[in-house]
């Protein structure tokens, strides 16, 4: 049961105090005690239940009621069993007693009244009255936790605006509302209460400018809401009728979780005594609720997708009918950004990522746009966000941003259990360069702090500045699997494509050429290609990169060996010793379900099929995938990238609820 | 061949800054490596600073590293060097330079190392 | 002072051969065959004669050559002609945190 306050009651005069249905008040017996008193006995009205803690009684009066030593060890409570028809109507009588003197009489007259500030603090989706109770001043994770949970309102509810509608403190329409979390203030008092008392709501400074309060007014036409706290405002006096009475406010996040904002907003209503005009207002009770920010959170490969986002470019046709095709198969929505829209910038994957968010009562898919900001740059902001689709953005939005801030280099994996942690949801995966120099590239500080500040996927950081690129997903995929965890992870492999060139030489077919029916390409010999040292010198150098990387996501994943696959692949090292893709790089794949898009490696042809398709064929076939291979040659991979970059997708969010996990 | 053409060259005070930017014609820059190289007057050539085609790393000269700045627009076939905290020593012709990023090549053929194509500079004057 | 050494100036006879050296270290020269040679004319952009230690863009006269040698590379130009008459630099790959160095520049007159 929540505190109530202290009362002290004296002989000389009445004490008038208010008593909040659902707290303990405590009583002062002792202070303003007369002097030649030694005991006390209490007598109260039927509404009210006092508690005195002290073992034994001093002595049985022959009335039945007990008297209590007054010493400092009494400890006198009360509670009010329901709230006052009127101001004072519930009455508790001390008597004091001596040896020498009759019982001197204390009157306390008590108003019981309810106050109490509720909402989903279960996360049922509805809103159930609370008294005041200490569990919702704290917030709690897991399936037996509890607190309320907020969204950012980052979605557009008017096409007609070109902000987000926490940018303003208006609500649209009872579909904005949705996006709020609802809080209720539940009153239950005397008539005339709150012509002596008054009750604020407020908010933290420090966190007034996290949250958006609106109180909804219901006019006779229609429901109407106006900001009561917000960014500039931390606290409003409610105008609160006497009797019984529910008030109804909607509360919207404004910022998401963050290096220094936990996520963590309270709100409450203080009850201030007013009725003493010369004096002060002096606070009696607070109630409160702690709600918590929904984070941001990543799909991995293994959820449903449900909408494809490809760019349509000079001379990509016969790639946008590929895709297509694949979106068709895995009944997927397609969304095309025209050429006039991406201004001549092909790379989907770089410019956005796209998670969702959620509370009990809602789920919003919320895209992040990354600061990289090239021609895709008003695509996240104008095309994506809209009615429940929302947006968020961090880092630099002009300039000092690295190749790495592309969100090519952020991934996610699938639930994994790592010992005794699980991560229902995940763990995010960015990369960075090994270890910091002059020129080493790393994931922009403000992004990293982001993910790492939404707790629900702990990020895993791995190394890939080793690439010209510098992006995880030039060198793993994940893939859904019907054994073992539910996927596999897919490593580009040097080591893996040597050994598949080797087979085929053994077997004859030295001669058969990379990059057939590529024009303008200089095709090679897989004997040339395995004769060339400096090219083994390079590939070797990449293996041990990607096993570093291996061995990492091992590490924090919590694989074996089994949950791995190897995807033939070659590399080259470039300007700065920096690696890209010999050949079309196969794990750069669009996984949509069972539907894989893969870079069509244009490998050596040998009895009729390309030996690289087949050997990846025989890998994920057995798990139930279909793979297609997609030419992306001229479009994509001679711009350094392939069809994962070139293509982006929302996916279905987890079934799991955040907020039942243990970060 | 590409051509370049340097501009935004100018006096300056101590401490200002200025942008100049390389635009490209004949060619898609996109294809290019691109360098700013300078030569103070009566002096040897000092690399400055590289963008690589894919426009994913950069690199600098020790003695302009935290002030100056190289990016791209591919769109608009340009590259800039963005200067700032100018100094007396920054006093200089500017060339900007490239190379074509041949994806033939199998190993690496140094040609971010080297400079094949040159603008005709742009005299950036830092001084009081 | 440059990162990698060079003559101030060297001079030959139209006809003759002349040989500039460039020296740098294990670092850069020692260690990486992008070795490249710019000719400049006064008040003119430079122009690649050499990369790659010894290769030459189309153009330019097979008079020009280059070679390498531990830390030093050299470019030689035989039968020189009165247009020769300019600056020289070398230039390097490097492992240092400036990743291309140039020379100091050498003078050719041709007499």
């Known amino acids: 049961m929540a505190q109530g306050t202290l009362i002290r009651v004296t002989p000389e005069q009445p004490t008038h105090a208010v008593c909040v249905l659902g707290t303990l008040t405590q009583l002062d017996v002792c202070s303003s005690a007369p002097e030649d008193c030694t005991s006390f006995s209490v007598n109260t009205s039927p509404g009210v239940v006092v508690d005195i803690a002290h073992s034994p009684p001093a002595k049985k009066k022959s009335t039945g009621s007990s008297t209590w030593p007054l010493d400092p060890g009494v400890e006198v409570t009360l509670t009010m069993k329901a709230a006052s028809g009127s101001t004072g109507d519930q009455k508790v009588q001390i008597s004091y007693h001596g040896p020498k003197t009759p019982p001197v009489k204390a009157l306390l007259y008590l108003t019981g009244v309810e106050i109490s500030l509720s909402a989903d603090i279960t996360r049922t989706g509805k809103v159930k009255p609370t008294r005041a109770v200490e569990d919702k001043r704290t917030w709690t994770w897991g399936p037996c936790g509890q607190g309320a949970i907020l969204l950012v309102n980052c979605d557009r509810d008017n096409p007609e605006s070109s902000a987000m509608d926490c940018e303003d403190d208006e609500v649209l329409d009872s579909k904005d509302l949705k996006d709020m979390s609802l809080m209720t203030l539940s009153t239950k008092t005397p008539q005339d209460f709150f012509t002596r008392h008054t009750l604020v709501l407020h908010v933290a400074r420090s966190e007034m400018d996290k949250v958006r309060v609106f109180q909804a007014t219901r006019g006779r036409l229609s429901s109407r809401c106006r900001v009561v706290l917000g960014p500039k405002q931390p606290s409003h006096y409610l105008m609160v009728p006497g009797g019984k009475h529910n008030m109804d406010f909607y509360v919207e996040a404004l910022a998401f979780p963050d290096t220094n904002f936990p996520g963590l907003i309270t709100l409450t209503v203080s009850m201030l005594d007013t009725s003493k005009l010369e004096l002060p207002e002096a606070v009696v009770f607070q109630d409160s609720v702690v709600f918590r920010v929904a984070p941001w959170i990543m799909t991995p490969n293994t959820q449903p997708p449900q909408e494809v986002y490809v760019c349509s470019i000079f001379e990509n046709e016969d790639f946008l009918k590929s895709v297509t095709a694949l979106a068709m198969q895995a009944r997927c929505k397609l969304t095309i950004c025209p050429e006039e829209e991406n201004m001549d910038d092909q790379w989907m994957q770089d410019e956005m990522e796209i998670g969702y968010i959620q509370a009990p009562h809602k789920t919003l898919p919320v895209v992040f746009d990354s600061p990289r900001n090239r021609g895709l740059k008003e695509f996240p902001i104008k095309r994506v966000m809209g009615p429940d689709f929302g947006y968020v953005t961090r880092g630099p939005q002009t300039g000092g941003v690295s190749g790495l801030d592309s969100f090519g280099n952020l991934e996610v994996s699938p639930p994994v259990t790592v010992g005794d942690k699980e991560y229902p949801l995940g763990r995010i995966l960015f990369g960075d360069s090994c270890y910091p120099s002059s020129d080493s590239r790393e994931m922009h500080q403000a992004l990293q702090d982001f993910l790492s500040a939404q707790q629900v996927q702990a990020p895993v950081k791995l190394y890939s500045d080793w690439l010209t690129v510098g992006h995880v997903d030039e060198f793993l995929s994940f893939v859904p699997a019907p054994d073992r965890k539910g996927f596999r992870l897919l490593l580009a492999s040097p080591r893996s494509c040597y050994k598949l060139f080797q087979e085929q030489q053994n077997e004859g077919h030295g001669d058969a050429l990379l990059f057939q029916g590529i024009k303008k390409k200089n095709q090679q010999k897989i004997k040339n290609i395995l004769s060339n040292t400096t090219l083994r010198e390079h590939n070797s150098f990449v293996e041990r990169c990607i096993d570093w990387n291996r061995e990492l996501l091992k590490r924090e994943l919590g694989l074996a060996e089994s949950d791995i696959i190897d995807i033939p692949q070659l590399f080259k090292l470039k300007e700065f010793s920096k690696a890209e893709a010999f050949f079309p790089n196969m794990v750069n794949m669009l996984v949509l379900g069972k539907h894989l898009g893969i870079p069509k490696p244009f490998g050596p042809i040998i009895n009729g099929r390309c030996c690289l398709e087949e050997k990846v064929c025989s890998l994920l076939e057995p798990l139930g995938l279909h793979c297609t291979f997609i030419n992306d040659f001229y479009t994509y991979h001679i711009r350094h990238g392939e069809v994962h970059c070139g293509t982006n997708v929302r996916r279905k969010p987890f079934s799991f609820k955040w907020w039942n996990m243990v970060p | 061949q590409v051509q370049l053409v340097e501009s935004g060259g100018g006096l300056v005070k101590p401490g200002g800054s200025l942008r100049l930017s390389c635009a490209a014609s004949?060619?898609?820059?996109?294809?290019?490596?691109v360098s700013w190289i300078r030569q103070a007057p009566g002096k040897g050539l000092e690399w400055v600073s590289f963008?690589?085609?894919?426009?994913?790393?950069?690199y600098y000269a020790d003695s302009v590293r935290g002030r100056f700045t190289i990016s791209r627009d591919n769109a608009k076939n340009t590259v800039y060097l963005q200067m700032n905290s100018l100094r007396a020593e920054d006093t200089a012709v500017y060339y900007c330079?490239?190379?074509?990023?041949?994806?033939?090549?199998?190993?690496?053929?140094?040609?971010?190392?080297?400079?094949?194509?040159w603008g005709r500079g742009t005299l950036v004057t830092v001084s009081s | 002072q440059s990162a990698l050494t060079q003559p101030r100036s060297v001079s030959g006879s139209p006809g003759q051969s002349v040989t500039i050296s460039c020296t740098g270290t294990?670092?850069?020269?020692?260690?990486?065959?992008?070795v490249s040679w710019y000719q400049q004319h006064p008040g003119k952009a430079p122009k690649l004669i050499i990369y790659?230690?010894?290769e030459r863009p189309s153009g330019v006269p097979d008079r020009f050559s280059g070679s390498k040698s531990g830390n030093t590379a050299s470019l030689t130009i035989s039968g020189l002609q009165a247009e020769d008459e300019a600056d020289y630099y070398c230039?390097?790959?490097?492992?240092?945190?400036?990743?291309?160095?140039f020379g100091g520049g050498t003078k050719l007159t041709v007499l």
């Open positions: 330079s490239s190379a074509n990023d041949d994806v033939d090549d199998i190993v690496a053929p140094g040609r971010g190392y080297y400079m094949d194509v």
């Open positions: 790659n230690v010894y």
């Open positions: 294990r670092g850069d020269v020692g260690r990486y065959n992008h």
């Open positions: 004949g060619s898609t820059l996109s294809d290019y490596f």
């Open positions: 230039s390097s790959h490097s492992r240092s945190s400036t990743p291309v160095l």
């Open positions: 963008i690589n085609a894919a426009n994913t790393f950069t």
